[in-house]
């Protein structure tokens, strides 16, 4: 089902999108992800805020927690204990960074319908979770980890050295949260809750980024974050495991780091429990082309964790960095030693491999000039994964099932032909033992979520079909969208073009390039969106194009690793090449071409504007990186190496926006940044502005006081209104 994009006889009742539509979120969609609690039961928060339990087999639903109870503590979230005796209710949500937040937690006892009194949890808590079995609680408060055997029990303190901005236990520091894990937590229960593993991050030697938060006090506050920029001192990480049944008996036991990793700076990248007494840790050298997966076993006699060298598996890249954006995680099979993992095959495409003893002897499960993207679930007889294989469109995602119980394994695409026009980009969520699963389709048509039988793949019911959205769009003139490719010098450039509703190839249109272009990103995806660029095409008659050039993902290592150690070169070249090809198509007004981007996209748009090609009349950079020396070590060094003379300092210096200040003279440039950006620091834009002023180059700028990298809330409305005015002026479009 696709929203009608053809002109019908009632054309006069159809209207274009307005900026107000976009800012009000009028055409936003809903998805439905079941909160699975067994093979055939799931929880869902209803529209009126009741917590409802659904039993798929019987079709019955049960309200297990009323909105009245939720409202009594102003709860915005909940979590049922695995033994179903208690529910935690989360309130006073206070956002910190991308994933992290603090909150107040109340424990509700389902057996007597009352809140647990006595030994209440402290506030605010940084992270809280139930054990996988029963109702033990682990939580992090003031950077220390605590354990409760039952919600009403007094807590057992596991760590004592936690200190704000110095030592983090069970939660990541800034850089691990944003660039490595990436989660708000750094603790992991073993499958039956016998052990609790956690990370300790020592940030004592990390330089601190400090910026003003203006608030409304007489004196601004200073925000201090230990933030390692490229080449700076990094956090020191250690992994510990504690027996939660007798936590005081031997206390936390450290898991040893593989010798080949420990010999220089390194990262911990993830932890996967295999059984209650076997754990798998992944480590990465600071120069991120060598990753080690280490399988460790509990030694009952010594009460320690043993990680034999024979259970170390090395993953190395000779052409780029290890993995895609992150090193992939293993999915273990039922024998608790072999596992499935996605990594590059000999042809340079990311595929699923089965590792039984050594990586060298890995059995390749998928293959082809496409990529396996995620392994969702491995059962006794099936492996479910997503890929972009179908019809050779890299920007699609379909779900596949491989039978692993039979030989040779047979492959079935579960989603390819379900709603072919409407749905080409899926994700999935599986119940225990994959008895049932939900499919969430993101487009290109209106998103829809459905429930399926895990054995037959039969659709059981529609969970969310966005009927209201479909009705609301009936009288809207949406732009047309096409996804195609350009073949240029042995490089395939996929692009998405968003065209005005009455598009006529014989006319000339202003062109706006929207760019992100970061390593391992993908912008050209078959997903539904009614957003700012939809409005620009629908109402303002612009053509908008998104192009996936070198450095982008899911099309093989040749394209992905082309930017290795050379950020800011090929990404920009490929946007320029695409623009030239678009001009050749004959419907672009070459005097009215603009480019805009946010974050990495702001960096690329700035470099494109300063490329000296004369192609762009104007452009916008929102929260851009301006020099890789200003950005986070974990991200930057993955792609650029170190900013040292004997490594890659030269390219760090050559790839700054400031070095091209002179070239902005002949373009209209709008530079935008939030002053409280914890991620891409305001420093980046401050340095661009300084360089432009020093070069006596005119430009426009807007800062957003106390706003972070997301420029949310009222700033969003101001931002898009401001950018709209800028573009309309640039393209000589009347207001």
């Amino acid at each position: 089902l696709r929203p009608s994009r053809v002109h019908n006889s009632e054309e006069n009742t159809m209207r274009a999108l307005t900026l107000k539509d976009i800012l009000n979120g009028t055409f936003s969609y809903k998805t439905f992800f079941p909160n699975w609690i067994s093979g055939q039961e799931y929880l869902h928060q209803s529209a009126d805020n009741n917590i409802v339990l659904y039993n798929i087999e019987t079709g019955q639903s049960y309200t297990i927690l009323s909105n009245r109870t939720m409202k009594s503590v102003n709860a915005s979230n909940y979590g049922l204990s695995p033994d179903r005796q208690f529910v935690y209710l989360e309130s006073d949500y206070s956002k910190l960074w991308r994933y992290s937040y603090t909150a107040t937690y109340y424990i509700y006892d389902l057996s007597n319908g009352e809140f647990v009194r006595g030994n209440e949890l402290p506030r605010p808590i940084q992270y809280l979770c139930w054990s996988p079995v029963g109702s033990k609680l682990a939580y992090v408060y003031q950077n220390n980890i605590y354990l409760k055997q039952r919600p009403g029990d007094p807590p057992f303190q596991i760590t004592f050295n936690g200190r704000e901005n110095k030592i983090f236990n069970g939660i990541p520091d800034w850089v691990y949260e944003e660039e490595m894990l990436p989660t708000k937590y750094a603790l992991w229960w073993s499958p039956n809750g016998k052990f609790l593993a956690y990370a300790e991050f020592n940030d004592k030697d990390i330089p601190v980024i400090a910026y003003s938060y203006y608030g409304d006090e007489q004196y601004p506050r200073t925000i201090n974050i230990p933030y390692p920029k490229a080449g700076a001192k990094n956090p020191v990480v250690r992994i510990f495991i504690i027996d939660t049944t007798y936590p005081a008996y031997v206390g936390p036991q450290e898991v040893p780091v593989p010798a080949m990793i420990a010999s220089s700076d390194y990262y911990f990248s993830w932890l996967t429990w295999v059984t209650d007494e076997r754990v798998c840790l992944q480590w990465l050298k600071r120069v991120q082309n060598v990753s080690v997966l280490s399988i460790c076993d509990f030694r009952e006699d010594w009460q320690t964790w043993d990680c034999p060298k024979t259970q170390e598996h090395i993953e190395e890249s000779r052409t780029g960095w290890a993995g895609g954006f992150f090193v992939s995680r293993p999915v273990f099979s039922y024998d608790a030693i072999s596992y499935y993992k996605i990594f590059s095959d000999k042809d340079g495409y990311k595929h699923i491999h089965y590792i039984k003893d050594t990586v060298e002897n890995a059995i390749q499960i998928t293959s082809g000039k496409w990529e396996a993207i995620n392994i969702f679930r491995v059962t006794q007889d099936s492996l479910f994964y997503s890929s972009n294989e179908f019809e050779e469109y890299p920007g699609r995602r379909n779900i596949y099932r491989i039978s692993i119980g039979s030989y040779p394994p047979s492959k079935k695409c579960v989603t390819c032909h379900l709603r072919k026009e409407r749905c080409q980009y899926y994700t999935a969520s599986f119940s225990d033992y994959a008895k049932y699963y939900a499919l969430v389709c993101y487009g290109p048509g209106i998103p829809i979520s459905t429930l399926h039988d895990g054995r037959t793949d039969q659709e059981i019911k529609i969970l969310e079909e966005n009927k209201e959205l479909e009705n609301a769009l009936k009288n809207i003139q949406l732009p047309k969208e096409e996804i195609k490719k350009l073949e240029v010098d042995e490089i395939t450039l996929w692009y998405k073009m968003i065209l005005p509703p009455q598009f006529d190839r014989s006319k000339k249109y202003p062109l706006l390039i929207q760019v992100y272009g970061g390593p391992c990103s993908q912008s050209v995806r078959s997903v539904f969106a009614v957003n700012w660029i939809s409005y620009l095409a629908s109402k303002e008659g612009m053509v908008i194009a998104l192009v996936d050039g070198r450095g982008t993902a899911f099309q093989g290592d040749k394209l992905l690793y082309a930017v290795y150690r050379k950020l800011g070169v090929y990404e920009v070249e490929d946007q320029i090449t695409a623009v030239r090809k678009f001009i050749e198509m004959g419907f672009i007004d070459e005097k009215r071409i603009a480019i805009w981007g946010w974050s990495y996209g702001g960096y690329v748009s700035s470099l494109a504007l300063a490329s000296g090609t004369g192609l762009f009349k104007c452009g916008i950079a929102v929260a851009p990186v301006s020099s890789w020396e200003y950005y986070a070590s974990v991200y930057t060094e993955r792609f650029m190496g170190l900013p040292t003379k004997d490594d890659n300092l030269e390219h760090y210096k050559n790839s700054t926006v400031m070095a091209r200040a002179e070239y902005f003279r002949n373009v209209d440039y709008l530079l935008i940044h939030g002053t409280a950006d914890d991620n891409v620091h305001f420093q980046n834009s401050a340095q661009i502005a300084k360089a432009l002023v020093n070069a006596q180059v005119d430009f426009q700028a807007m800062w957003y006081s106390d706003q972070n990298h997301g420029l949310s809330g009222l700033s969003t409305n101001h931002l898009y209104t401001h950018m709209t005015h800028f573009l309309k002026q640039c393209f000589s479009l009347s207001d």
Epitope: Q40, Q60, L80, R84, L110, S111
Partner: nanobody, 123 residues
Framework: QVQLQESGGGLVQAGGSLRLSCAAS????????MGWFRQAPGKERELVAA???????YYADSVKGRFTISRDNARNTVYLQTNSLKPEDTAVYYC?????????????????WGQGTQVTVSS
Amino acid sequence: QVQLQESGGGLVQAGGSLRLSCAASGRTFSTYAMGWFRQAPGKERELVAAISNGGSAYYADSVKGRFTISRDNARNTVYLQTNSLKPEDTAVYYCAARRGSAYYTNRIDWPYWGQGTQVTVSS
């Protein structure tokens, strides 16, 4: 170990009421969660209502507001008051027990069962 015996079923007209009882043997009745399930011909056995050892109850949305579950720990009995009965309520009604939480809706999670009592609602 707990033994369960249901009673109170019968034939009733649509809109009518019945009170089902379930007598349990054993001194530890008060520590068990109790539930009422029903099974119509050719259909899955489904949980209708359950009550925890602490007295907290919940219901299938299809019977909410019409059925009431209660327990009398002194009499080792759990009740299901069924009002405004509909023809689709026709089924064999089973009493079930489990240790721990009442908030399980799969029959497999309830180890102890009665023999069942027939409820027939005529239109």
